[in-house]
């Protein structure tokens, strides 16, 4: 399938549209402090050049690498070694070097201004003065605050954010049409991008077995009717689509995924009987509605497991002719029957399973040797259903923001050493846990609350990553992707913390807060309460209950006052007092 | 200045309810922290329950969760005590508790207090 030109083949397979919008998404993730107009620039003159080898694939330049062609377009930007330092270095590399250090130096915390939405009537005209450029715009400011952002959903995303704007600037009341819209977009997006920061990091981590072994659980849960050969081509094609977008090469990427919707939706008879309307959809939406799609009904009558992974005399024959086609006939197995785990949990008991056979097929008596594997089983699933019962019966009882707060003095106790921001995103995230999947019967909570959980605690550990402080957070995220929210139940207090020194300028709020979204008031809360952690970590959590309430209490009142500020000024320092006097700081 | 008044303690079997009143005095009564604390003969005052001035918070001692109720009436300038399932542990003088910071009365600091009421709870 080799192509004289590959940016021409590109271009002919995904149209100037998607190119150009996949180019610019791509340039913005690498580059993430570039200016808008400089990264259009840059779009604009290879989208010029992708042209001129579709007219001529034999032209000068058109047989690169799309990794060449768009590293040496990136290396023309004159300010590169002022705004992004080191990374500059990388265009003294060759490929396929550049293009991993360019990698490398993508920030998954870039020191961007927080976007204020403008009111609506603005929005509404630059959209109308210029579309194009208001939605390139979009792509530009979303990839570079989220740079593995899944490009062709980014694409999806766009094209509602189009189409939500072209519907409410027609609306009586614009605002009342657009606002939820674009919330919804904003949430979603944000869920998306964390989603997929998980795949790259179990890609750039833990390396590709791993993330096809994540695939093989969560696509048999979801086709269980499909043959073991169909789940595993599947996990082939998709591993090599995000292998592709998880390592910038977007174009090939996105090509790919269309191909792979294609692929599924010619073999849906095969596959799954919930695909017919995905199918039916236009190339964005289906590709998004075939990765969202609920879960198949299971056969019915499936067989035992015991037969063949436990009774049969054969099983360490099978495992030694090809270890991890058995592992993943095994997994296949087991998430097929069991939609109501989560996947972290089947790859836990096939990893088990997996430790079991190595042992003991080295063992005298094989058979003897594993044959009760299956009851290793039953403590790893019974940890987190019983982790979930407690924790959506405390969410239930606390309510979403103090749910979140019980988590943010948890977790500022397990790791206190982790930046105050960091921690109040995490737990916050965390918190939604409940909202999101309590509500489900049990059948469903587990997958949803813990495969969640696994991506929130990711975040932790990419912006741990960054700038590490805690060996305790290095531990948990390097040790194993599927025990990594384990790891952090398991830790307890850090006993080693030296309490940080007291600054009543961290305690010290004025009259802006009072003008503050809830949401934005939440946040001012629970970064106190994290740093009273941070003070006072031996707290008990009515102690801290007590001066949450007194917070709440003072925040209330000066807000009501006539002199806001004098009233924030002078109770503010009682109420410093006073939580100084009863937590003994 | 805020004066305190308990009332409603006795002599009740183990299992029964009582329901203590704590009558305020002052006009900004909403602007205090309410609490509950006992003693016991031979043993330190401690923390039974308290509610935010606004009553929209609460908080309870483990030994009492569950059982105890705290509540308050900001229009009738009380604050009360439900207690259901009482036993003998439970016998105590309880004293109410004001304080414009819920952490101080939490910590046992509260600047003003009742004289106590007596609750006796027989097997």
């Known amino acids: 399938d080799a192509h004289k030109s590959e940016v021409a083949h590109r271009f002919k397979d995904l149209g100037e549209e998607n190119f150009k919008a996949l180019v610019l998404i791509a340039f913005a993730q690498y580059l993430q402090q570039c200016p808008f107009e400089d990264h259009v620039k840059l779009v604009n003159e290879v989208t010029e050049f992708a042209k001129t080898c579709v007219a001529d694939e034999s032209a000068e330049n058109c047989d690169k690498s799309l990794h060449t062609l768009f590293g040496d377009k990136l290396c023309t930007v004159a300010t590169l070694r002022e705004t992004y330092g080191e990374m500059a270095d990388c265009c003294a590399k060759q490929e396929p070097e550049r293009n991993e250090c360019f990698l490398q130096h993508k920030d998954d915390n870039p020191n961007l201004p927080r976007l204020v939405r403008p009111e609506v009537d603005v929005m509404c005209t630059a959209f109308h003065d210029n579309e194009e450029t208001f939605l390139k715009k979009y792509l530009y400011e979303i990839a570079r605050r989220h740079p593995y952002f899944y490009a062709p959903e980014l694409l999806f995303f766009a094209k509602r954010y189009k189409a939500a704007f072209t519907e409410c600037c027609q609306a009586a009341d614009k605002a009342a049409c657009l606002l939820p819209k674009l919330d919804e977009l904003r949430d979603e997006g944000k869920a998306s991008s964390a989603k997929q920061r998980l795949k790259c990091a179990s890609l750039q981590k833990f390396g590709e077995r791993a993330f096809k072994a994540w695939a093989v659980a969560r696509l048999s849960q979801r086709f269980p009717k499909a043959e073991f050969a169909e789940v595993s081509k599947l996990v082939t094609d998709l591993t090599k689509v995000h292998t592709e977008c998880c390592h910038g090469d977007l174009l090939e990427c996105a090509d790919d995924r269309a191909d792979l919707a294609k692929y599924i939706c010619e073999n849906q008879d095969s596959i799954s009987s919930k695909l017919k309307e995905c199918c039916e959809k236009p190339l964005l939406e289906k590709s998004h509605c075939i990765a969202e799609v609920e879960n198949d009904e299971m056969p019915a009558d499936l067989p035992s497991l015991a037969a063949d992974f436990v009774e049969s005399k054969d099983v360490c024959k099978n495992y030694a002719e090809a270890k991890d086609v058995f592992l993943g006939m095994f997994l296949y197995e087991y998430a097929r029957r069991h939609p109501d785990y989560s996947v972290v949990l089947l790859l836990r008991l096939a990893k088990t399973y997996e430790t079991t056979l190595e042992k003991c097929c080295a063992a005298a008596d094989p058979h003897e040797c594993y044959a009760k594997v299956f009851d290793e089983f039953k403590p790893l699933v019974e940890e987190p259903q019983n982790l979930i019962k407690q924790n959506c019966e405390l969410f239930e009882q606390l309510g979403e923001y103090k749910f979140q707060n019980a988590l943010l003095v948890r977790y500022t106790k397990k790791v206190p050493q982790v930046s105050t921001p960091t921690l109040v995103e995490v737990s916050r995230n965390l918190g939604k846990v409940g909202s999101k999947c309590c509500k489900h019967p049990e059948a469903k909570r587990m997958p949803c609350a813990e495969d969640y959980l696994s991506v929130v605690l990711n975040q932790l550990c990419v912006l741990h990553e960054k700038t590490p402080v805690s060996d305790r957070v290095t531990k948990c995220c390097t040790e194993s992707l599927v025990n990594r929210r384990p790891c952090f139940s398991a830790l307890e207090v850090d006993e080693t913390y030296v309490p940080k020194e007291f600054n009543a300028e961290t305690f010290t709020f004025h009259a802006d807060i009072c003008t503050l979204s809830e949401k934005e008031r939440q946040i001012k809360k629970q970064t106190a309460l994290v740093e009273l952690v941070k003070h006072k970590p031996k707290a008990t959590k009515e102690q801290l209950k007590a001066v949450m309430d007194d917070f709440a209490a003072f925040v209330e009142k000066c807000c009501k006052a006539d002199d806001k500020e004098t009233c924030f000024a002078e109770e503010g320092k009682k109420l410093v007092a006073a939580s100084q006097a009863a937590l003994g700081l | 200045e805020v004066q305190l008044v308990e009332s409603g303690g006795g002599l009740v079997q183990a299992g029964d309810s009582l329901r203590l009143s704590c009558a305020a005095s002052g006009r900004t009564f909403s602007s205090y922290a309410m609490g509950w604390f006992r003693q016991a003969p031979g043993t330190e005052r401690q923390f039974v329950a308290r509610i935010t001035g606004k009553g929209d918070s609460t908080d309870y001692a483990d030994s009492v969760r569950g059982r105890f109720t705290i509540s308050r009436d900001n229009a009738k300038n009380t604050v009360y005590l439900q207690m259901n399932s009482l036993k003998p542990e439970d016998t105590a003088v309880y004293y109410c508790?004001?304080?414009?910071?819920?952490?101080?009365?939490?910590?046992?600091?509260?600047?003003?207090w009742g004289q106590g009421t007596q609750v006796t709870v027989s097997s």
């Open positions: 508790a004001a304080d414009a910071f819920n952490s101080l009365l939490q910590a046992g600091r509260a600047e003003y």
